[in-house]
Interface confidence: low
């Protein structure tokens, strides 16, 4: 929908710092097709760890931890000439404000590891 | 902080559907050390595309698109026995409610591609 004329962008300095948010989530089922097994089939496989916090919305977030320092080759051996590294994403969560538990939150940034990818190490040439 | 006794979890059915949210973000600088070049060094490299929407908070989100169908081998050639696939993450964003532009939002789920990983294809044996 086009922005209402005169509405400041939510990231502008003059935007109200406290807003009303409706928690009835739109697009609730975006993940219905996402039962992916990439974590197991990747050359940089990862495990998923449950991060739970009742003071946060969403209260459960899954974090990826790479299984190896190296990457898995076609024969299933770990090749240490390559590195498995976490791909990180900054997400927004709602953190309950402790003084007004029922309906007051603050936006919080979280850095989460979503999965792993296999990279060539940075080679330093020493003179 | 421990949950205030009697506070319902924000995902409970009886939790208020409209809440107050403070937009002064906590942990604003979580990404200060993250100038990562994994997108270029990965065996499943990706490009980053800017997705901008002034009706959304955050208004700018970067989306990954895998560069190849296959994965890049040690010699820099694309190996089509492996597949580059996007790692997706479900994130929460705030969507401006069109009727009350200044301070009313609704939570919305978005599925974003954060990066790519290299996977072994699922081989189907045909009888």
């Amino acid at each position: 929908s086009p922005q209402n004329p005169g509405c400041p962008n939510a990231e502008d300095k003059n935007f109200p710092r406290t807003v009303m948010v409706n928690l009835n989530i739109r697009n609730r089922n975006t993940n219905s097709k996402r039962a992916s097994d990439y974590y197991n089939r990747s050359s940089s496989p990862w495990n998923l760890h449950r991060n739970e916090d009742p003071e946060r919305y969403p209260s459960v977030i899954w974090e990826a931890k790479c299984r190896h320092l190296g990457c898995v080759d076609a024969d299933g051996n770990v090749d240490y000439h390559m590195n498995s590294v976490p791909i990180q994403q900054e997400i927004l969560v709602l953190r309950r404000e402790p003084r007004h538990c029922t309906n007051s939150f603050r936006l919080e940034k979280m850095l989460v590891s979503v999965g792993c990818t296999c990279v060539t190490p940075i080679v330093r040439h020493v003179a | 902080s421990p949950q205030n006794p009697g506070c319902p979890n924000a995902e409970d059915k009886n939790f208020p559907r409209t809440v107050m949210v403070n937009l002064n973000i906590r942990n604003r600088n979580t990404n200060s050390k993250r100038a990562s070049d994994y997108y270029n060094r990965s065996s499943s490299p990706w490009n980053l595309h800017r997705n901008e929407d002034p009706e959304r908070y955050p208004s700018v989100i970067w989306e990954a698109k895998c560069r190849h169908l296959g994965c890049v081998d040690a010699d820099g050639n694309v190996d089509y026995h492996m597949n580059s696939v996007p790692i997706q993450q479900e994130i929460l964003v705030l969507r401006r409610e069109p009727r009350h532009c200044t301070n009313s939002f609704r939570l919305e789920k978005m599925l974003v591609s954060v990066g790519c990983t290299c996977v072994t294809p699922i081989v189907r044996h045909v009888a």
Epitope: K65, L69, Y80, V85, V119, P121 | R34, A35
Partner: nanobody, 124 residues
């Protein structure tokens, strides 16, 4: 430049205990993962245990319940406490770490580093 220095290897009796330690030094910004691998004569290098920045740990099935990995973030040090040692634990133990660090004004977000290895011999 980042260096990993191991200590604590040596000869130990079967059923005994040994503690290895490894310290990372250099212009380190953060250590994502620290851990131990081992290589027995004529065999491939294999994972023993890894500990992640959040504190969670992963172990090889062969050492679960006998070995414990821990780390001291303030000292950039990882420890491996080995109990109920068996002859098949005899190997060169290598410290490994995935480290973000500065070098020549550039931030390297992630690179694997290895120690020189320390020999652990379990006599039966």
């Amino acid at each position: 430049e980042v260096q990993l220095v191991e200590s604590g290897g040596g000869l130990v009796q079967a059923g005994g205990s040994q503690r290895l330690s490894c310290t990372a030094s250099g212009t380190i910004v953060n250590i994502h993962v620290m851990g131990w691998y081992r290589q027995a004569p004529g065999k491939q290098r294999e994972l023993v245990a890894l500990i992640f920045s959040g504190g969670s740990a992963d172990y090889a099935d062969s050492v679960k319940g006998r070995f414990t990995i821990s780390r001291d973030n303030a000292k950039n040090t990882v420890y491996l406490e080995m109990n109920s040692l068996k002859a098949e634990d005899t190997a060169v133990y290598y410290c490994a770490a995935e480290i973000g660090y500065y070098s020549g004004g550039t931030y390297y977000s992630s690179e694997a580093h290895w120690g020189q290895g320390t020999q652990v011999t379990v006599s039966s």
